[in-house]
């Protein structure tokens, strides 16, 4: 017997779609061998219709595909726009059609239910609105108009022009009779329920002269859209529920084992704590559509998700919904990177951010997740150089190490910096990732003076003390600008043997400015790194003043409050201050503060994805 398994019989109706899932033992050979769907002919030969190698027969062109899911030993054949000609005997299998592992599937496509002649079919999703059209002759214009529902052999009155409304349809049905000359009346039913499904009869007048029209109303719960995303990646649910509910509260919920739906996030401010720091609900557009982004996908995020609208912000029968079935692929293309990075107050962190290596030219961004209301993510820094003003001198985005990873360094840490941050690009949105920064007890490893005042024309020497554990690291000084940190010549003080022995007095790297000029004013970072991987940094501000006869002045830069021109990531990226809403894939008009300077500088912290190992990565 073949170890391949699937449905023995599949039945559907014309115009419908089927999704046939075949299961196979997920051995390494099976996972990577050819998968196929073929039709058995009279001769016994099985003619390939679609295969995992990209082949699609002309009969299936534009309406079928085969997707392999090697990690769980399944492949799925989707066939749309079924016709009765598709009825027949098929095989789903692995390897070669004539020999190899396969399973027999019988597909039967029928015409659909037998309906009275002239029946109009209305196919509508649950929660939506249907308008049933009922024509009549002139002589029945003044007479009673009515809509009945056929239940078995009886007809139950639903609504009529004498103001009767069946209690099951209360507050969601209306009968419209147009002005003179128009020989059609309409019945509009809102917020359709599954129980509204069935055969209806429009009637105008009575007796043998009455006008009748049959309507078959098919109320469907929306077929879940299958969504496959990578572990650690990101998913976006786009939800369009229609103008009728544009001003009603929206939600995303996940169906649980009891077949009820737990709210994940809604526009009333509710959010499931399991998604803290990694979810945003994008403010809706005028048409009522909205989207929800979830990053840092976990295996336990798998399941059926529904978005919907209801004043309570949760699922209620008879309100519109959209559905998805999310699968999280554990054989992820997105590399592991720490989900938690720890730093000490006054110290620094370096965050490694993955991006799609095929998109090395994409713009890179880092934003701070804010949980208020539906969540938002104001951009703090971007690869083109813009840095939020309140982060000046302490935040930098570096292209290194490259090849699918960039680095973000944040120093002068305070407890206010604790929180969730998102790494993203204007390219592949599935590569958005989340990292949490935690501020822990401890002292910074690098010690620099407090803010320094230099005298114009004189020499300034700034020491940076480092502990023995950094003796093998490369030490550097750089001048910070909003486009990075330009490396400067610096010197290790003391002979090399002193470092080998780690002499207490020799752990010093100094920056000398000689002579000091006006252009030297600004932020300087002392840092350590190993190749393209950055360790800790410490920042010092150098103020430059004229030579004074006596006394000295201590200069401290004024830190700006929130930047007025703030960019925010929703599920797209928005600029505040009446700027255009922008999709993160486009960024047509970036606001850039012109500045130059090579990017260098960085920091390393102890990291925790579950352990507290240092953050790693692969160099170019």
């Amino acid at each position: 017997k073949s170890p391949v398994f699937g449905p023995q019989e599949v039945s559907s109706v014309e115009g419908n779609s089927v999704s046939i899932k075949c299961y196979y033992p997920p051995t390494s050979v099976n996972r990577h061998t050819r998968k196929y769907w073929c039709r058995k002919g009279a001769s016994g030969r099985c003619i390939t219709l679609v295969s995992s190698e990209g082949y699609v027969s002309s009969n299936y062109a534009g309406r079928a595909n085969l997707t392999n899911f090697p990690e769980n030993g399944t492949f799925v054949v989707n066939i749309a726009q079924l016709s009765r000609d598709d009825s027949g005997h098929y095989k789903c299998g692995l390897g070669i059609n004539s020999r190899g592992l396969s399973f027999d599937v019988s597909l039967e496509v029928s015409q659909g239910p037998e309906l009275p002649n002239g029946t109009e079919v209305y196919t509508v999703d649950v929660g939506r609105t249907v308008t049933i059209k009922c024509p009549f002759k002139t002589e029945n214009a003044p007479k009673t108009k009515a809509l009945y529902k056929k239940i078995g052999q009886t007809s139950v009155l639903v609504i009529d022009s004498r103001n009767y409304v069946n209690p099951n349809y209360k507050d969601r049905i209306r009968l419209r009779i147009p002005g003179t000359g128009q020989l059609i009346f309409t019945v509009v039913i809102d917020r359709l329920r599954l129980s509204d499904h069935g055969l209806y009869l429009c009637q105008a007048g009575d007796g043998s002269n009455r006008d009748e029209k049959n309507a078959d109303l098919q109320v469907l719960e929306p077929e879940p859209e299958l969504v496959y995303e990578d572990l650690r990646g990101s998913v976006t649910f786009h939800c369009a529920l229609g103008l009728e509910v544009a001003n009603v509260a929206k939600f995303l919920c996940r169906v649980n084992s009891r077949e009820t739906c737990d709210v994940v996030i809604n526009t009333l401010g509710k959010r499931d704590s399991a998604f803290e720091g990694r979810i945003l609900l994008n403010p809706q557009d005028k048409d009522g559509s909205f989207s929800v982004v979830i990053t840092g996908l976990r295996k336990e995020d798998e399941g059926r998700y529904l978005c919907g609208a209801h004043s309570d912000g949760q699922l209620q029968e008879g309100w519109p919904i959209q559905a998805w079935q999310l699968f999280v692929n554990e054989e992820s293309t997105i590399p592991r990177s720490p989900t938690v990075v720890k730093g000490v107050a006054g110290g620094s962190v370096a965050v490694l951010c993955p991006y799609n290596p095929k998109e090395s030219q994409s713009l890179k961004y880092w934003c701070l997740w804010e949980g208020a209301q539906n969540g938002r993510c104001p951009l703090l820094v971007e690869s083109q150089g813009l840095v939020q003003e309140q982060y000046e001198g302490r935040l930098s985005l570096l292209q290194e190490p490259g090849n699918g990873t960039f680095t973000v360094i944040l120093n002068q840490l305070t407890t206010q910096d604790a929180g969730f941050y998102w790494c993203l690009t204007n390219g592949d949105t599935r590569w958005r990732t989340t990292v949490e920064i935690k501020i822990i007890e401890g002292e910074p490893n690098l010690k620099v003076p407090g803010n320094v005042t230099a005298v114009l024309g004189e020499t300034l020497n700034i020491p940076c003390h480092f502990p023995c554990k950094f003796s093998s690291y490369e030490k550097y000084w750089c001048k910070w600008s909003n486009t990075g940190c330009q490396t400067l010549p610096s010197q290790d003080e003391g002979p090399s043997e002193a470092f080998v022995n780690c002499d207490e007095n020799s752990r010093l790297v100094s920056l000398t400015l000689n002579p000091v000029t006006r252009a030297d004013e600004g932020w300087y970072w002392c840092g350590v790194k190993q190749g393209h991987f950055y360790g800790e940094t410490a920042a010092v501000y150098v103020a430059v003043e004229e030579k004074k006869v006596a006394g000295s002045r201590y200069v401290s830069p004024a830190k700006a409050d929130a930047a007025p021109d703030e960019k925010v990531l929703d599920s797209g990226v928005r600029e505040i201050e009446n700027k255009a809403i922008q999709d993160p894939r486009l960024f047509a008009e970036e606001k850039v503060v012109a500045d130059t300077g090579d990017q260098a500088g960085g920091s390393r912290a102890s990291v925790d994805s579950s352990s507290s190992e240092e953050q790693g990565g692969s160099s170019k």
Partner: nanobody, 129 residues
Framework: EVQLVESGGGLVQTGGSLRLSCAAS????????MGWFRQAPGKEPERDFV?????????????YYADSVKGRFTISRDNAKNTVYLQMNTLKPEDTAVYYC?????????????????WGQGTQVTVSS
């Protein structure tokens, strides 16, 4: 909460037929799966897959059968009654077992009992030789 109630079990001779019913009550989403499993005497707690039915929107059905019952058993559903049936023909003594009805996720492997969320109490089927 979904409740499942089985009926139709009994004693039958080899080669005879039985029709099991499983009535579901409570809220279920329309894309759903229901299956039949059986537990042979002395085989507790093992439940073997017999047949399953997945449906979406009352118009598309997928029927799955264990090799041991292919061609003899037929699974079907009555939409209006929210009931799933298992028609068992040409019964053999090895079909003797407690038959359980289960309800579960439309997307899971229909053969895996752990994938089903709801279970009925079971109905005894005895095939005498």
């Amino acid at each position: 909460e979904v409740q499942l109630v089985e009926s139709g079990g009994g004693l039958v001779q080899t080669g005879g037929s039985l029709r099991l019913s499983c009535a579901a009550s409570g809220r279920t989403f329309s894309s759903y799966a229901m299956g039949w499993f059986r537990q042979a005497p002395g085989k507790e707690p093992e439940r073997d897959f017999v047949a399953a039915l997945r449906w979406s929107n009352d118009r598309t059905y997928y029927k799955y059968y264990a090799d041991s019952v292919k061609g003899r058993f037929t699974i079907s559903r009555d939409n209006a009654k929210n009931t799933v049936y298992l028609q068992m023909n040409t019964l053999k003594p090895e079909d003797t077992a407690v038959y359980y009805c289960a309800g579960g996720n439309y997307f899971s492997d229909p053969r895996v009992d752990k994938e089903y969320n709801y279970w009925g109490q079971g109905t005894q089927v005895t095939v005498s030789s």
